[in-house]
């Protein structure tokens, strides 16, 4: 068997809502994966499990089952959404995300994804981890790859 390649492309969109009373942020983050089947037979993408972390705390999980079949030497682009919640001991981020005086409301999230594929009864798992910027201050649609993580520092003006 030849390889099945999984490439995490990035965040496609992030839709944000708030609970003012609970100082809670809800972020629905849609991610894009490219899965390439380098074999001369079809493989089934059985499931995708995803997890999102902020500052080493898991803020969201998702699992998709029986997703698709990828034909021989074919590639499919798959979107999956992870609902995340920033609350409780992380609720200080509510102010960072909502204060108008703050001009940039990006936070760095770690996206973890595991793809399980099967062919001829054989199962294979491929995992990826990526740091991504997500805007927690407004609904955002990203160009693919636009949310890749970099780093610079400045104080609130």
């Amino acid at each position: 068997p030849r390889s099945i390649d999984v490439k995490y492309i990035g965040v496609k969109s992030a839709y944000v809502s708030y609970d003012v009373q609970k100082r809670t942020i809800y972020l629905n983050i849609t991610n894009t994966l490219n899965i390439t089947n380098n074999n001369y037979y079809s493989v089934e993408v059985e499931n995708i499990t995803a997890q999102v972390q902020f500052s080493k705390t898991v803020i969201g999980k998702a699992r998709l089952n029986n997703i698709t079949i990828i034909g021989p030497l074919d590639m499919k682009q798959i979107d999956y959404t992870v609902p995340t919640v920033i609350a409780e001991e992380m609720s200080y981020m509510y102010d960072f995300c909502t204060l108008i005086s703050i001009k940039v409301h990006n936070i760095v999230l770690m996206m973890q994804v595991t793809v399980t594929t099967t062919y001829f009864g054989h199962s294979e798992q491929i995992s990826q981890e990526r740091y991504q910027y997500v805007d927690c201050g407004r609904n955002t649609t990203y160009q693919l790859g636009q949310s890749e993580y970099l780093n610079v520092l400045q104080p609130q003006q």
Epitope: S55, Y92, D95, T98, L99, V104, L153, Q154, Q156
Partner: antibody, heavy 125, light 107 residues
Framework: EVQLQQSGPELVKPGASVKIPCKAS????????MDWVKQSPGKSLEWIGH????????FYNQKFKGKATLTVDKSSSTAYMELRSLTSEDSAVYYC??????????????????WGQGTSVTVSS | DVQITQSPSYLAASPGETITINCRAS??????LAWYQEKPGKTNKLLIY???TLQSGIPSRFSGSGSGTDFTLTISSLEPEDFAMYYC?????????FGGGTKLEIK
């Protein structure tokens, strides 16, 4: 120049309440959140809670829920902390402090960048 | 709550010396630690934020390092005005918590 001006020392009786003001100047009051900190005699610092002057939203250290109430008056750029049902355990110096968020491309943390001079509260009959 | 253990609680040194103060968190707090200086009759002063970034207007003899659970404040070439109380504070998760403080005195 950023300043947080607190009121003078308070001597209060057990069971009573006290309301400590913290008047902000030198910056736009609603641009920053405000934290409150307790320092008991000979002890370290304890974080009481935090208020966002825009919407009055608060978050309290569980230990101080029911003891402290944080409010703001935007018109006078003043934050307040009310302490109720006072006991000798509440005798301490109380500080207000401006919380600043640091960011570049993304969130990079925060800190209390300006502090009030502290208000001493003594609970005694 | 995240416990912060600060050491030493007391330190005697001479002007010109270099000293270090340590803070250890009970769990990882990433880089989210600040250092403050407390002096009688003055308002508390922010020295370092995000573990290692020097606050504007603070002399470069102050430096911070560390991430995760272990952090250090270093003051090189101590000046007479540096003798004070020092506190660290984590802001990775609510409630914010402080170290027990270090009293730096002249030897």
């Amino acid at each position: 120049e950023v300043q947080l001006q607190q009121s003078g020392p308070e001597l209060v009786k057990p069971g009573a309440s006290v309301k400590i003001p913290c008047k902000a100047s030198g910056y736009t009051f609603t641009d920053y959140t405000m934290d409150w900190v307790k320092q008991s005699p000979g002890k370290s610092l304890e974080w009481i809670g935090h208020i966002n002057p825009n919407d009055g939203g608060t978050f309290y250290n569980q230990k101080f829920k029911g003891k402290a109430t944080l409010t703001v008056d935007k018109s006078s750029s003043t934050a307040y902390m009310e302490l109720r049902s006072l006991t000798s355990e509440d005798s301490a110096v109380y500080y207000c402090a401006r919380w600043v968020y640091y960011y570049g491309i993304s969130y990079e943390g925060g800190a209390m960048d300006y502090w009030g001079q502290g208000t001493s509260v003594t609970v005694s009959s | 709550d995240v416990q912060i253990t600060q050491s030493p609680s007391y330190l005697a040194a001479s002007p010109g010396e270099t000293i270090t103060i340590n803070c250890r968190a009970s769990k990882s707090i990433s880089k989210y630690l600040a250092w403050y200086q407390e002096k009688p009759g003055k308002t508390n002063k922010l020295l370092i934020y995000s573990g290692s970034t020097l606050q504007s207007g603070i002399p470069s003899r102050f430096s911070g390092s560390g991430s995760g659970t272990d952090f250090t404040l270093t003051i090189s070439s101590l000046e007479p005005e540096d003798f004070a109380m020092y506190y660290c504070q984590q802001h990775n998760e609510y409630p914010w918590t402080f170290g027990g403080g270090t009293k730096l005195e002249i030897k």
